[in-house]
Interface confidence: low
């Protein structure tokens, strides 16, 4: 299916709009730090080339390929040197080592200031004035601070901006309509960001065998009642389709998740009752249902797995002649039974079996020897129900912030050499799970639970990688996709790090505290209670909870008196005092 | 491509027998586990039977037992089910999938027994 012109071709499948805004996209996260201004007049000379292109596939330069279309634009960029420093090397070289060499500059945690919400009317104003460029300043600056998120899936984010603006900028009440919308909007691709980074991570760092493992068992989940074939042609194409936007190559992403929507929709039949929503629907939303569509219901009379797997004197046979579509068809089998189990467990399970059968098969009796096989799955089956279960317990028992709280410390204790920051961001994370997941009914929890923290995790990971301070974190997020969670939870306290010093900058505190806001409170919190465990990593929960209850009392008072900065100034040396001795 | 092509159905007295056959291309026949499985206009699809990849182990539902039988021909890779003492409840449209899928995956057969 070749074409005289690649961008031609783009151009006219993906129409004008999208074309545009997905350039943008694909620009946004590659020169994270240029001004707004500067990636549209690119974004204009990219589209005012490609229409030409349409007009005359041979004119000059159309037959070229994307990434050398792209690569030369970005190149072009004058403040590309002092801006990005070694990034402006990539200009060197030649596709498609350039595009490559891009990638590997993306930054997942970009120097960019917190996004500061202005005020209602500001931006119905803005909104008014040029709702063109209101989205586009969406898109990129949403673009900018998440270099891997999915880019069709943004563009369905921002036909929801939009939507959210045309309808509650002509509200009554224009704050009320809007704000709750923008939020569900920030927690939405908060979620959507993070998930799109761990499927990339899968492909970069493990291989496009352990995405498709991936895929075939949540595949296989949503949609139990199809074959085993309409299963592998959908993982293949939707492989297909997140190889080419975690490698940048947005257009042709797009572009092929919307053949996938279409072929999902006209065959429905054969893969899920659960799809004839989502395919009424304009594309963006389709294409955004179907990925998050229920899981279908799975047929009654299914018999039992032991047959063809462990009973049948063919395993072996099998499993020698198609390893991987053996291997493949077993996952199905097992996820489609299995809509209770989080995908990882289900991977874990199958590595389990390609274990047993890559030692039994070469044994004397190989039937005897994987006969236990599903035994041994009890083990793998369990721990995750556990931890679930009792993390369940606890958030139940403390509430939001102080299962949060205890995640800090437990997490702190584990990895000490970790940032501040990092640790915050990502144990307050992992404490969303109890929200999240905790309320769902018992079959839903571990799906939810342990596919979540995956994804919380691969952020630990991400930015670890970028900054690598801990041989341990560095050991759970490479070894094995599948078992870092596992690797995360049996940590223990480091026994051979060596405390930090006590800093009584760290933990003053001025009047300032007392305008943040209630989130921004609990973070002020959360980093001081880190850094008190890094200071002394073996400090009791008793002697924690001591400190971090007068602190809060400290903060109310100070926050209640008359000269707020005085009282700060007095009381905040007595807090610290007081600190050191009950944790001496 | 993954192909399964049935044949030999057809309309056929209650008591009366036929034989279908699932002709397979496009994978290693050999090495999965096959099944039956019909479906009635309006209602959900039935699992029939299912044969393992060497044909050794056989299952079969409740409302058949006795009457099909399954088997195959690795060599020829094609699915077999031998129909016997056909009921006027066994009129149905028969397909083959792969491992134990109840799902449609190709246009089936249709098998009418009138009584």
């Known amino acids: 299916d070749t074409h005289k012109s690649e961008v031609a071709h783009r151009f006219k499948d993906l129409g004008e709009e999208h074309f545009k805004g997905l350039v943008l996209v694909a620009f946004s996260q590659y020169l994270q730090q240029c001004p707004f201004e500067e990636h549209v007049k690119l974004v204009n000379e990219v589209t005012e080339f490609a229409k030409t292109c349409v007009a005359d596939e041979s004119a000059e330069n159309c037959d070229k390929s994307l990434h050398t279309l792209f690569g030369d634009k970005l190149c072009t960029v004058a403040t590309l040197r002092e801006t990005y420093g070694e990034m402006a090397d990539c200009c060197a070289k030649q596709e498609p080592e350039r595009n490559e060499c891009f990638l590997q500059h993306k930054d997942d945690n970009p120097n960019l200031p917190p996004l500061v919400r202005p005020e209602v009317d500001v931006m119905c104003t803005a909104f008014h004035d040029n709702e063109a460029t209101f989205l586009k300043k969406y898109l990129y600056e949403v673009a900018r601070r998440h270099p891997y998120f999915y880019a069709p899936e943004l563009l369905f984010f921002a036909a929801r901006y939009k939507a959210a603006f045309a309808e509650c900028c002509q509200a009554a009440d224009k704050a009320a309509c809007l704000l709750p919308k923008l939020d569900e909007l920030r927690d939405e691709g908060k979620a959507s960001s993070a998930k799109q980074r761990l499927k990339c991570a899968s492909l970069q760092k493990f291989g496009d065998r352990a995405f498709k493992a991936w895929a075939v068992a949540r595949l296989s989940q949503k949609f139990p009642k199809a074959e085993f074939a309409e299963v592998s042609k959908l993982v293949t194409d939707l492989t297909k389709v997140h190889t080419e936007c975690c490698h940048g190559d947005l257009l042709e992403c797009a572009d092929d998740r919307a053949d996938l929507a279409k072929y999902m929709c006209e065959n429905q039949d054969s893969i899920s009752s659960k799809l004839k929503e989502c395919c009424d629907k304009p594309l963006l939303e389709k294409s955004h249902c179907l990925a998050e569509v229920e899981n279908d219901e799975m047929p009654a009379d299914l018999p039992s797995l032991a047959a063809d797997y462990v009973e049948s004197k063919d395993v072996c046979k099998n499993y020698a002649e198609a390893k991987d579509v053996f291997l493949g068809m077993f996952l199905y089998e097992y996820a489609r039974r299995h809509p209770d189990y989080s995908v990882m467990l289900l991977l874990r399970l199958a590595k389990a079996y390609e274990a047993t059968l890559e030692k039994c098969c070469a044994a004397a009796d190989p039937h005897e020897c994987y006969a236990k096989v599903f035994d041994e799955f009890q083990p793998l089956v369990e721990e995750p129900q556990n931890l679930v279960k009792q993390n369940c317990e606890l958030f139940e028992q403390l509430g939001e912030y102080k299962f949060q709280n205890a995640l800090l410390v437990r997490y702190t204790k584990k990895v000490p050499q970790v940032s501040t920051p990092t640790l915050v961001e990502v144990s307050r994370n992992l404490g969303k799970v109890g929200a999240k997941c905790c309320k769902l009914p018992e079959a839903k929890r571990m799906p939810c639970a342990e596919d979540y923290l995956s994804v919380v995790l691969n952020r630990l990971c991400v930015l670890h990688e970028k900054t690598p301070v801990s041989e341990k974190v560095t050991k759970c997020c490479t070894e094995s996709l599948v078992n870092r969670r596992p690797c995360f939870s049996a940590l223990e306290l480091d026994e051979a790090y060596v405390p930090k010093a006590f800093n009584a900058e760290t933990f003053t505190f001025h009047a300032d505290m007392c305008t943040l806001s209630e989130k921004e409170k609990q973070v002020k919190k959360q980093t001081a209670l880190v850094e008190l465990v890094k200071h002394k990593p073996k400090a009791t929960k008793e002697q924690l909870k001591g400190v971090m209850d007068n602190f809060a009392a400290f903060v109310e008072k100070c926050c209640k008196a008359d000269d707020k900065e005085a009282c700060f100034a007095e009381e905040g040396p007595k807090f610290v005092a007081a600190s050191q001795a009950a944790l001496a | 491509e993954v192909q399964l092509v049935e044949s030999g159905g057809g309309l056929v007295q209650a008591g009366g027998s036929l034989r279908l056959s699932c002709a397979a291309s496009g994978f290693t026949f050999g090495s999965f586990g096959m099944s039956w499985v019909r479906q009635v206009p309006g209602k959900g699809p039935e699992w029939v039977s299912a044969i393992d990849s060497g044909g050794t182990d056989t299952r079969y539902a409740e409302s058949i037992k006795g009457r099909f039988i399954i088997s195959r021909d690795n060599a020829k890779k094609t699915l077999y089910l031998q129909m016997n003492s056909l009921k006027p409840e066994d009129t149905a449209v028969y397909y083959c999938?792969?491992?134990?899928?109840?799902?449609?995956g190709s246009q089936g057969t249709q098998v009418t027994v009138s009584s």
């Open positions: 999938t792969i491992g134990q899928s109840t799902s449609r």
